[in-house]
Amino acid sequence: EINGSANYEMFIFHNGGVQILCKYPDIVQQFKMQLLKGGQILCDLTKTKGSGNTVSIKSLKFCHSQLSNNSVSFFLYNLDHSHANYYFCNLSIFDPPPFKVTLTGGYLHIYESQLCCQLK
């Protein structure tokens, strides 16, 4: 299911980098979140629960990330103009069933003021 544009602020700039916020419903217990740049997988994070509610977090394509009870943040550093693109949060929900996939995204605009190491 393609949901289109995120209805929240997806990109947060700081210190020459960007935090890309991928939100999900807090009812979701087990999931995979992928960050896509265009059609390319940049990062992913999978949260699963084992017996005794032990939580396991795995990444096949590792980025610096941060998990909360309703979002995954992926961090990109050393921004330059090549980072400008469409970014998508691709959420696959395993629990609660049934399995659902949902895609939300937006365009990352890069302005001079947000670049990492500007020459003065």
Epitope: N3, K23, I27, P97, F99
Partner: antibody, heavy 125, light 108 residues
Framework: EVRLVESGGVLVQPGGSLRLSCAAS????????MHWVRQVTGKGLEWVSA???????YYSDSVKGRFTISREDARNSLYLQMNSLRAGDTAVYYC???????????????????WGQGTTVTVAS | EVVLTQFPATLSLSPGERATLSCRAS??????LAWFQQKPGQAPRLLIY???NRATGIPARFSGSGSGTDFTLTISSLEPEDFAVYYC??????????FGPGTRLEIK
Amino acid sequence: EVRLVESGGVLVQPGGSLRLSCAASEFIFNSYDMHWVRQVTGKGLEWVSAIGTAGDTYYSDSVKGRFTISREDARNSLYLQMNSLRAGDTAVYYCTGDRTVVRGVNYYYYGMDVWGQGTTVTVAS
Amino acid sequence: EVVLTQFPATLSLSPGERATLSCRASQNIRSYLAWFQQKPGQAPRLLIYGASNRATGIPARFSGSGSGTDFTLTISSLEPEDFAVYYCQQRISWPPITFGPGTRLEIK
């Protein structure tokens, strides 16, 4: 008019097999998660099995390993293959559908809003 | 498995009266509860989803409330066609999807 029509319910001997079908019309079948729910005469409702829009399948413990659910979206059809039937499987079998929509932080569940009229399965010798 | 308990098992009322049916879940299911009506020889009909949202075509006299573990279906003024069996159902912690045992609403 939204319709689900079940068929395939007959009298079958214990240990036998049966295939139930459910034909859908007038709604977007491939956007619905589909279920089989059964009811023994004079008793309550019991969920049997489900199949998601992605083809993921789920079963109650009482039928796991004996029943197989499947769907054919191109034909707007749902199926339940029932093997190793027991007397306890005797019931009216309903096919029903529901929808889950995820948007950002919102998880919407719309309930089983389409039902068939039911088909009767009798397991007896 | 989430166990749903419904009470009373039978409710005897007259047309025009207010009916209050209860459903209790064995664990927190938030607002992911539905109510169904079933008449003899017919399939169940969805009345309420998400604990408080009326399904398409359901009269305004039907309303649902509650969250977490305690839920209520209210029929503000009973019509003759409302006498039936009512089931609650959860589909957030599954499999299995579970139904309550039902409340029979009968004419006094």
